[in-house]
């Protein structure tokens, strides 16, 4: 029962992570203008995202412009776009794998196979979490490096946008949810001793792999 509860918690966390990841990728708030110069009166704020940039006037009016040419975009932006989309698709694939192996579905009858599918989905979610983390951390690193580079003009400097925080949250939820799904899986998929094991060793307990045997610390 506890195993089922952890599975549900794991999949809920990954779903939340996926939604966060989607919002993070879609919102044009990866980079926000950082007007630091004492002499500058801020009349507008510029938001930059993966797909568009927006200018917010002091009046509250917002104008967004979708980036025109794909080839004209910087390579790091193209890579961030690709990783974001791949991460979301990988997480969706993980969800499908999970549904096939979930306790409450009948796609797969055999317990061993169900357990393997849940474990696979957990690994897939962890991969999705890592893929989400890469563009977010890369962008944050570039923003911070610019911020402390004395030769980068103040007008060119940016601050960390809300999308980056959402991206970190998404990555954390996917890693955590995926980790939980990995941990809930018994190694043989058996809830009790198999009849083969019982025939030869009646005293042997069911071998279930505990959380500590999976290197989840590498993912979370």
């Amino acid at each position: 029962m506890a195993s089922a509860g952890m599975q549900i918690l794991g999949v809920v966390l990954t779903l939340l992570g996926w939604v966060n990841g989607l919002v993070s990728c879609a919102l044009p708030m990866w980079k926000v203008t950082a007007f630091i110069g004492n002499s500058i009166v801020v009349a507008q704020v510029v938001w930059e995202g993966l797909w568009m940039s927006c200018v917010v006037q002091s009046t509250g009016q917002m104008q967004c412009k979708v980036y025109d040419s794909l080839l004209a975009l910087p390579q790091d932006l193209q890579a961030a776009r690709a990783l974001c989309v791949i991460a979301l698709l990988v997480a969706l694939f993980g969800l499908l794998v999970y549904l096939a192996g979930a306790k409450c579905t009948t796609c797969v009858e055999e317990k061993d196979s169900k357990a393997r599918l849940v474990l696979t989905s957990g690994i897939v979610f962890v991969i999705s979490g890592v893929l989400t983390l890469i563009p977010v951390c890369w962008t944050a690193h570039a923003i911070i490096r610019d911020f402390y580079n004395p030769l980068v003009a103040e007008a060119q400097k940016r601050e960390l946008g809300a999308s980056l925080y959402l991206g970190w949250a998404a990555s954390g939820l996917l890693l955590l949810g995926g980790g939980l799904l990995c941990c809930t899986c018994p190694s043989g998929g058996s809830q009790g001793p198999s009849h083969y094991m019982a025939r030869y060793s009646t005293s042997a307990p069911a071998i279930s792999r505990g959380p500590s045997e999976y290197p989840t610390k590498n993912y979370v």
Partner: antibody, heavy 119, light 107 residues
Framework: EVKLVESGGGLVKPGGSLRLSCAAS????????MSWVRQTPAKRLEWVVT????????YYPDSVKGRFTISRDNAKNTLYLQMSSLRAEDTAVYYC????????????WGQGTLVTVSS | DIQMTQSPSSLSASVGDRVTITCRAS??????LAWYQQKPGKSPQLLVY???LLVDGVPSRFSGSRSGTQFSLTISSLQPEDVARYYC?????????FGSGTKLEIK
């Protein structure tokens, strides 16, 4: 109009010291990052040092670290470069440079002051 | 340290010619590259920053471009006043280094 006037250059023996000054006018001095860049007799440009607008952060290449010290007096609108343990390879025209709010890099250059290190 | 290899070291062209100076970084510097012009007897002047952005007041015949770690400064139609020495400089990380310069002359 941005004006940067360097002074303090001259002839100095190897191992000697020299202090360069840069008087700034035509802008609010304490808003801007300032730097020194030198040009060798072979016409090569070399970045020497950079200081943040408030003076709290300084940046040096390894070639001058420990020998050169940059400082600024925002009240006097003046930038300084204290040079010690001078070597023959430090012979160059030293330019005082102001950063800009809009442009990256070394935006405004002074006319330069010549430092000759020779025995 | 990041090395900036500038070529050619000198260049002679006719008025109206299209002139290109190139600069290659020894490693990735993203778009953290500036171009400077130094006219005879004068101090250098910033022309281009962030590899492609022109400083206000710089004639539109000047343009900057980037392809990976190779950067170019192009003068679409050479004018007599463009006679100068041109330098590239990266500001990706410390130490900031300059190219060796290109001396541009009129034929």
């Amino acid at each position: 109009e941005v004006k940067l006037v360097e002074s303090g250059g001259g002839l100095v023996k190897p191992g000697g010291s020299l202090r360069l000054s840069c008087a700034a006018s035509g802008f609010t001095f304490n808003y801007y990052t300032m730097s020194w860049v030198r040009q060798t007799p072979a016409k090569r440009l070399e970045w020497v040092v950079t200081i943040s607008s408030g003076g709290g952060r300084t940046y040096y290449p390894d070639s001058v670290k420990g020998r050169f010290t940059i400082s600024r007096d925002n009240a006097k609108n003046t930038l300084y470069l204290q040079m010690s343990s001078l070597r023959a390879e430090d012979t160059a025209v030293y330019y005082c440079i102001r950063g800009d709010y809009r442009y990256d890099g070394f935006a405004y250059w002074g006319q330069g002051t010549l430092v000759t290190v020779s025995s | 340290d990041i090395q900036m290899t500038q070529s050619p070291s000198s260049l002679s062209a006719s008025v109206g010619d299209r002139v290109t100076i190139t600069c290659r970084a020894s490693e990735n510097i993203d778009s953290y590259l500036a171009w400077y012009q130094q006219k005879p007897g004068k101090s250098p002047q910033l022309l281009v920053y962030a590899s492609t952005l022109l400083v206000d007041g710089v004639p539109s015949r000047f343009s900057g471009s980037r392809s990976g770690t190779q950067f170019s400064l192009t003068i679409s139609s050479l004018q007599p006043e463009d006679v100068a020495r041109y330098y590239c400089q990266h500001y990706y990380s410390i130490p900031y280094t300059f190219g060796s310069g290109t001396k541009l002359e009129i034929k």
